[in-house]
Interface confidence: low
Amino acid sequence: KLTIESTPFNVAEGKEVLLLVHNLPQHLFGYSWYKGERVDGNRQIIGYVIGTQQATPGPAYSGREIIYPNASLLIQNIIQNDTGFYTLHVIKSDLVNEEATGQFRVYPELPKPSISSNNSKPVEDKDAVAFTCEPETQDATYLWWVNNQSLPVSPRLQLSNGNRTLTLFNVTRNDTASYKCETQNPVSARRSDSVILNVLYGPDAPTISPLNTSYRSGENLNLSCHAASNPPAQYSWFVNGTFQQSTQELFIPNITVNNSGSYTCQAHNSDTGLNRTTVTTITVYAEPPKPFITSNNSNPVEDEDAVALTCEPEIQNTTYLWWVNNQSLPVSPRLQLSNDNRTLTLLSVTRNDVGPYECGIQNELSVDHSDPVILNVLYGPDDPTISPSYTYYRPGVNLSLSCHAASNPPAQYSWLIDGNIQQHTQELFISNITEKNSGLYTCQANNSASGHSRTTVKTITVSAELPKPSISSNNSKPVEDKDAVAFTCEPEAQNTTYLWWVNGQSLPVSPRLQLSNGNRTLTLFNVTRNDARAYVCGIQNSVSANRSDPVTLDVLYGPDTPIISPPDSSYLSGANLNLSCHSASNPSPQYSWRINGIPQQHTQVLFIAKITPNNNGTYACFVSNLATGRNNSIVKSITVSASGTSPGLSAGA
């Protein structure tokens, strides 16, 4: 069927349109185009005779039309009056006629729109604003954008006048935004420039900062006022109702108690004509006295005396605070505070209670601290220690012993040999000693303030012969590749050489062996099972030598990868399967079996009588050493064949 297609259907003024013919019949004589929906000679645009290829203009021809041999019609430089229907009349060679009608619409190219407003400075919560999109254009659609977003849904927003007018009722400060309008028709779309809505608002209730309302005499008062407002607010300050100054900040240096009172900030917006005020009450306090601590006992005795510390002066309705060692008071049954917190009592003082102690008086603004006080706790003497630690000496050397005991005041020392007083000194010196100097050496420490005494006795042996040494160890069961072991040769003796043997041999050279402490200590790093040997230490001097009894190191190791025996993997049906698992381990490991992943028994030997091909599969032995915390396993594949089916098979166990 003959049809006409308009390309495009919507045409912009000044552009062109092509009326494209589809399904044009064969064997034509000619055709004519008419303006309108029917064939009307008065409205013929152009005719075309195929035989002569001659185009003849009609009454409606404007000079902007071009006809093509395929009957399509191009109209150029389109004007508004071109809108409407166009009819093609086709005359076939058999003089039978056929008609088809097409149409298009013409629209103007839109100009760039602009926004007009009925109120350039609306007041918040009071005014409405109507924006209108100019110019008014027929067949145009109007759209609005706020901050480049489509209009939000709001009961305060209303579109009217075919969406050409946007009204904002009861404007708020949040309506301050960029507004644009857009005009659209089928052939063009244009957006206006932005219009910024300037909403007048405020002032809101001002805020005064800082929020602090308490000050100390002598400080500076610096208050700042701010209120949300458009245009910005003008500020005024009043103190106790009296105008002070028209500034946003109020500064008063070196305030006194007389500056206490009500401080008012007033904010004024000249455009809205509104005023708002905020009041803050400022209190100025006088400087309190510095506290100090008194004590009822300046030299308390440890574990005997109590001490009461009192914070002075006594002030009514005051909070007292305490600190020990710059920390708040620890929770302790030996620390007690009086009801008003002014007195701190230490029950049964110890040497650790020396302090320092501080008390504080809290006022409305801050805490004033006392100077620190340190307690002089009398203690001791503790059990004295005698040095050096040697107990064996050779004849002819000098004996020099020193005694020390923790004590306050420092202890007075006395030395006794075999119960007989020798001298009142901290050190005892005897030159060129002999066997006769062997005996019990007693140091006595005395605290003159507490009257307490403590003694320590040390046995000194003067002999050319050395005693039989012994070995002490810091780890009786070390784990292989993990632990270290330190052997120490006892006793410690003066001018003595220490020697070591392993399995009767002198020490091998090894980075894992280290001698220290004058060769008195032998350390084995990262012990291995090969270190499980007999260790002997020896001591010698110029006249004597002696050896210890051997100490055998018990190294925990393993389990190593287990071995399943016998090694056979093929068995005849009917044989007995007797698998034994072994893993090197100290102590002996725990054994368990898994067949094809299924747990079996916890034994070293797995026995299955009269096996069949159903017993084919993987046999896993698992070993675990609870002492080392280590585990290991191995898997063996077992194949069972029906009797006589394959030569060379094991008969089993």
Epitope: N596, P599, A620, F622, R630, N631, V635
Partner: antibody
């Protein structure tokens, strides 16, 4: 404490081979235990793939056995999974896990999982 | 192969409720283990060897059973217990139940 961390590509083409590595920290692989792979298709349950021991001994799920290879590298304290000829059905979160040695065989330590998507 | 049936597949309970999940096997197994899996996380061992509480697991979780029927119980459901729970056995090879999703009403 013992930690396991899976690593490997998150996308594998169909018919190619999926490769994942599990790095063990806080424990030496050669000290024992069995080291497992378990997977979980999106929104589905858990499926065991197999395990390897430090000595190289392996045990695989029969349904995947023909496509699975597991390796262990004790020097790097790592073990790995290779799954060949993958299809979309192999898309899953793949977990490595340690089997606890309590004779009852359960998984006491897991990696956080690695999502592998099979897609062209 | 041993078939495992875990039920229910999902449940909704209130905080403080007692929650019970069952796991049945097609033939007898020695032990059952139970895991908790929260969204986007790896499974976490809760109960091993049927009734033993894993290290650091709250005592409100427990397990019991033998043969072919095993039970997992939360004595008093807490908000942090929202998860999927799986039973697990190892016979010829390891298999898991289909999972039970636990939600709070």
């Amino acid at each position: 404490q013992v930690q396991l961390q899976e690593s490997g590509p998150g996308l594998v083409r169909p018919s190619q081979t999926l490769s994942l590595t599990c790095t063990v920290s806080g424990f030496t692989i050669s000290s024992g235990y069995s080291w497992h792979w378990v997977r979980q298709p999106p929104g589905r349950g858990l499926e065991w793939i197999g395990y390897i021991q430090y000595s190289g001994i392996t045990n695989y799920n029969p349904s995947l056995k023909s496509r699975v290879t597991m390796l262990v590298d004790t020097s790097k304290n790592q073990f790995s999974l290779r799954l060949s000829s993958v299809t979309a059905a192999d898309t899953a979160v793949y977990y490595c896990a340690r089997e606890d040695y309590d004779y009852h065989w359960y998984f006491d330590v897991w990696g956080q999982g690695s999502l592998v998507t099979v897609s062209s | 192969d041993i078939q495992m049936t875990q039920s229910p597949s999902s449940l909704s309970a209130s905080v403080g409720d007692r929650v019970t999940i069952t796991c049945s096997t097609s033939s007898s197994v020695s032990y059952m283990h139970w895991y908790q899996q929260k969204p986007g996380k790896a499974p976490k061992l809760l109960i091993y060897s049927t009734s033993n509480l894993a290290s650091g697991v709250p005592s409100r979780f427990s397990g019991s059973g033998s043969g072919t029927d095993f039970t997992f119980t939360i004595s008093s459901l807490q908000p942090e217990d929202i998860a999927t729970y799986y039973c697990h056995q190892w016979s010829s090879y390891p298999t898991f139940g289909q999972g039970t999703k636990v939600e709070i009403k």
